[in-house]
């Protein structure tokens, strides 16, 4: 009796089962009662990542510069391309199909996370007690000066984008 | 017992037809795919021909293509091959095999052609 | 198409000997290899499937191996029996082909 299902890694043609082509390689003609499933390598630039019955691989994927792209992994015959952006540059998505520049974090925010090729900077607003005076995506919020450890005062309260300013004692008379 | 018996062999001369028959026995002879392989006077063995078992589907090497036919009558359990314009080099002992999980796993006894002036 | 190299043509071996007979295949076939024996006036006869695997009433001295384009026919211990023409067939694609054997005889 013909077979209405086959066993993993197979596929039903022509009332039999034949061998799914192995990742890295595509198919070229179907199994008979006579010959196994002929599968082929794929190509150059190309890939196919599953037991399949394509009859063509896929290209891998292009990482364009102009989009700020640049290859992370290089593809095999069973596995695509990866991109990921230059430096200073992050994927739009998880496909990574282009590139925005990092945020910066303004005056008043520091970096609470360093951006990275697949995510953006995460700032933070400055809490009391510290601040930030540049826009940076690198720079975290800097504590004020300690006026006391040098033998100063305060002369003018820090903020979240200054720091204090500190002068010396009055003297007494 | 499965059983392959083939006839039709015989002498002839260049350029003639001869048909060739396989009688199957002891299985279901519509389930399965059926061969013919030849083997000349060095021992060397030749694929000839192959038929699917529903005989929809037909399968011959360059050498052969265009004047050998293998067919099949299913309900006579019976494979045929004719052979047409016939040369020296289709000089051979002719055998019937069954297709088993994509191997001859049965044989026949064969038949002899002999293609001579 | 594929054609089988099998090696070497003649083998002299002595009852108890064990043999390895080699095919070589021009081109990668993965397991889809069979192989045949055929003793004298006799038809050929299928030993092993799949490059591998055993057919049942074939004894244990015969053990095949190998993937992709090398191919071994293993003879644990050589019987009298044994003696005649080994051929390898590949079923990997059209046209199906044959090597063109490998005589084991008598020393």
């Known amino acids: 009796e013909p077979p209405t299902a086959c066993r993993e890694k197979q596929y039903l043609i022509n009332s039999q089962c034949c061998s799914l082509c192995q990742p890295g390689q595509k198919l070229v003609s179907d199994c008979t009662e006579f010959t196994e499933t002929e599968c082929l390598p794929c190509g150059e630039s190309e890939f196919l990542d599953t037991w399949n019955r394509e009859t063509h691989c896929h290209q891998h994927k292009y990482c364009d510069p102009n989009l700020g792209l640049r290859v992370q992994q290089k593809g095999t015959s069973e596995t695509d391309t990866i991109c990921t952006c230059e430096e200073g540059w992050h994927c739009t998505s998880e496909a990574c199909e282009s590139c925005v520049l990092h945020r910066s974090c303004s005056p008043g925010f520091g970096v609470k996370q360093i951006a990275t090729g697949v995510s953006d900077t995460i700032c933070e607003p400055c809490p009391v007690g510290f601040f930030s005076n540049v826009s940076s995506a690198f720079e975290k919020c800097h504590p004020w000066t300690s006026c006391e450890t040098k033998d100063l005062v305060v002369q003018q309260a820090g903020t979240n984008k200054t720091d204090v300013v500190c002068g010396p004692q009055d003297r007494l008379r | 017992e499965v059983k392959l018996v083939e006839s039709g062999g015989g002498l002839v001369k260049p350029g003639a037809s001869l048909k060739l028959s396989c009688a199957a026995s002891g299985f279901t002879f519509s389930n399965y795919g059926i061969s013919w392989v030849r083997q000349t006077s060095d021992k060397r063995l030749e694929w000839v021909a192959s038929?699917?078992?529903?005989?929809?589907?037909?399968y011959y090497p360059d050498n052969v293509k265009g004047r050998f036919t293998i067919s099949r009558e299913n309900a006579k359990n019976t494979l045929y091959l004719q052979m047409s314009s016939l040369k020296s080099e289709d000089t051979a002992l002719y055998y019937c095999a069954r297709a088993g999980e994509k191997a001859m796993d049965y044989w026949g006894q064969g038949t002899s052609v002999t293609v001579s002036s | 198409d594929i054609v089988l190299t099998q090696s070497p043509v003649t083998l002299s071996v002595t009852p108890g000997d064990s043999v390895s007979l080699s095919c070589r295949a021009s081109?990668?076939?993965?397991?889809?290899l069979h192989w045949y024996q055929q003793k004298s006036h006799e038809s050929p006869r299928l030993l092993i499937k799949?490059?591998?695997q055993s057919i049942s009433g074939i004894p244990s001295r015969f053990s095949g191996s190998g993937s992709g384009t090398d191919f071994t026919l293993s003879i644990n211990s050589v019987e009298t029996e044994d003696f005649g023409i080994y051929f390898c067939?590949?079923?990997?694609?059209?046209?199906?082909?044959f090597g063109a054997g490998t005589k084991l005889e008598l020393k």
């Open positions: 081109q990668t076939i993965n397991n889809n």
């Open positions: 799949y490059a591998s």
């Open positions: 067939q590949q079923f990997s694609s059209w046209p199906l082909t």
């Open positions: 038929i699917s078992s529903g005989g929809d589907n037909t």
